[in-house]
C-alpha cells in the first residue's frame, strides 16, 4: 500500500494541474523544503520507469546573488477546496468439486477506503519580480561553494517558481482490509475436512501540517558570466556553461509582459512565437 501522503498529492495534482507542469512532492518529510525561489537539482532516475527526482540544495536564489537582496515577493493565488473520498471493495469466491471426490472452496475480499478534505493555495513568483531581481543583482563572486560543487558534478539546477500548499493542517486516513476464507473436504474411509478464515486490517493516518508543499513548478537556471533563468524547458540545456566569447551579455529594458494570474512562465511561448 503506497504512502497516504503520496496518494493525496497525486490526486490533488491530477485535479489542479491538467498541463502536467507541477512536480509532486514525494515525501512529507521533504515537503517544507520546496518554497518559491529555492534551488533544487534534478537527480536522474535509476530506471526508465521512474520519473527523475528533485532534491533541495538548501539554498535560495538570493543566497547566490549580490548585493544582498531582501526576500523577494511571492504572489498568493486563490484557494481551492479539495475533497476526495474513495470506498472500494472487491470480493470473489471459488469452489472446485468432483462428484464423490475432494471439494475445495475459497473466498476473498479486499476493501480500501479513504477520505480527504483540504484547502490548497498557490504561491508563485511574480514574473516582474524576477526581472527586477536579475537586473538589480548579479551572481555572487566567487560563486557559492554549493554552486561550485554542482558545477563540478555537472548537475542542472532549477529554481522553484510556484508551489501548491496546504492552508490548514489536514489529517488523511486510509483503511485497507483483507479477508479470506477456505475449506476443503476429502471423502473416503476417513473423511477429512478443514476450514479456515482470516482477516487483516490496516489503517494509516498522516497529519499534513499547514503550509506543507504538495507540488511545485520549476524553471532551469542558466549560469555563464551571470545568472539567468530559462523560460522554456529544453532537454539539452545545461545550467553551467562556459562564458561566451565575443558577445556582450544581453540586457533587456522594460517590464515583463503581464501574464494572466495562474499562468506559468512556460505558457508565454505561444505569444513570443506568433507576435
Amino acid at each position: 500500500m503506497g504512502s497516504a501522503f503520496e496518494r493525496v498529492v497525486r490526486r490533488v495534482v491530477q485535479e489542479l494541474d491538467h498541463g502536467g507542469e507541477f512536480i509532486p512532492v514525494t515525501s512529507l518529510q521533504s515537503s517544507t523544503g520546496f518554497q518559491p525561489y529555492c534551488l533544487v537539482v534534478r537527480k536522474p532516475s535509476s530506471s526508465w520507469f521512474w520519473k527523475p527526482r528533485y532534491k533541495c540544495v538548501n539554498l535560495s536564489i538570493k543566497d547566490i546573488l549580490e548585493p544582498d537582496a531582501a526576500e523577494p515577493d511571492v504572489q498568493r493565488g486563490r484557494s481551492f477546496h479539495f475533497y476526495d473520498a474513495m470506498d472500494g471493495q472487491i470480493q470473489g469466491s471459488v469452489e472446485l468439486a468432483a462428484p464423490g471426490q475432494a471439494k475445495i472452496a475459497g473466498g476473498a475480499a479486499v476493501s480500501d477506503s479513504s477520505s480527504t478534505s483540504m484547502n490548497v493555495y498557490s504561491l508563485s513568483v511574480d514574473p516582474n519580480t524576477w526581472q527586477t531581481l536579475l537586473h538589480e543583482a548579479h551572481l555572487r563572486q566567487p560563486e557559492h561553494a554549493v554552486l561550485q560543487q554542482l558545477a563540478s558534478a555537472g548537475d542542472n539546477v532549477y529554481v522553484v517558481t510556484e508551489v501548491l500548499q496546504t492552508q490548514k493542517e489536514v489529517e488523511v486516513t486510509r483503511t485497507h482490509k483483507r479477508e479470506g476464507s477456505g475449506r476443503f473436504s476429502l471423502p473416503g474411509a476417513t473423511c477429512l475436512q478443514g476450514e479456515g478464515q482470516g482477516h487483516l486490517s490496516q489503517k494509516k493516518t498522516v497529519t499534513i501540517p499547514s503550509g506543507s508543499t504538495l507540488a511545485f513548478r520549476v524553471a532551469q537556471l542558466v549560469i555563464d558570466s551571470d545568472l539567468d533563468v530559462l523560460l522554456f524547458p529544453d532537454k539539452k540545456q545545461r545550467t553551467f556553461q562556459p562564458p561566451a566569447t565575443g558577445h556582450k551579455r544581453s540586457t533587456s529594458e522594460g517590464a515583463w509582459p503581464q501574464l494572466p494570474s495562474g499562468l506559468s512562465m512556460m505558457r508565454c511561448l505561444h505569444n513570443f512565437l506568433t507576435d
Epitope: V222, L230, L231, D234, K235, A244, S250, S252, P257
Partner: nanobody, 121 residues
Framework: QVQLVESGGALVQPGGSLRLSCSAS????????MSWYRQAPGKERELVAT????????NYADSVKGRFTISRDNAKNTVYLQMNSLKPEDTAVYYC??????????????WGQGTQVTVSS
C-alpha cells in the same frame, strides 16, 4: 550591433531540397529561441518552425511537418532549416527570428531581412 543574416534561398524544382542558414551576431545566441517564418506574396507572415535555446525542443507548422527540419549550432551562432520534398506552395520569403528565451532577454526580438525561396518547374 545585432544582425541576423539569412542565406541559402534559391529557385528549386518541386520535390527538391534546400538548406537555409541564419547567422547571428551581436547578442548571446544561446539565450534565444530561434524561429523561421515565411511570407508568400499577398499573404500574412506565418510561423514555420521554432527551436529552443539548446536545441532540445522543436515545433513545426502542420504544413511542413515531416518535410522540414530546424536545427541550431550554438558554437557557430547559426540556425538552419532543412527543407525536403518542396512544393510550389512553399514559395515565399523566409525570415529568421530570435526571441528572448530567458528572463534577462525576454523583451528582445530580432528579425533578419529574409531570403527568397521559389519552388517551380
Amino acid at each position: 550591433q545585432v544582425q541576423l543574416v539569412e542565406s541559402g534561398g534559391a529557385l528549386v524544382q518541386p520535390g527538391g531540397s534546400l538548406r537555409l542558414s541564419c547567422s547571428a551576431s551581436g547578442f548571446t545566441f544561446s539565450k534565444y529561441l530561434m524561429s523561421w517564418y515565411r511570407q508568400a506574396p499577398g499573404k500574412e507572415r506565418e510561423l514555420v518552425a521554432t527551436i529552443t535555446t539548446a536545441g532540445g525542443n522543436t515545433n513545426y507548422a502542420d504544413s511542413v511537418k515531416g518535410r522540414f527540419t530546424i536545427s541550431r549550432d550554438n558554437a557557430k551562432n547559426t540556425v538552419y532549416l532543412q527543407m525536403n520534398s518542396l512544393k510550389p506552395e512553399d514559395t515565399a520569403v523566409y525570415y529568421c527570428k530570435a526571441s528572448g528565451g530567458t528572463i534577462r532577454t525576454v523583451n528582445e526580438t530580432y528579425w533578419g531581412q529574409g531570403t527568397q525561396v521559389t519552388v517551380s518547374s
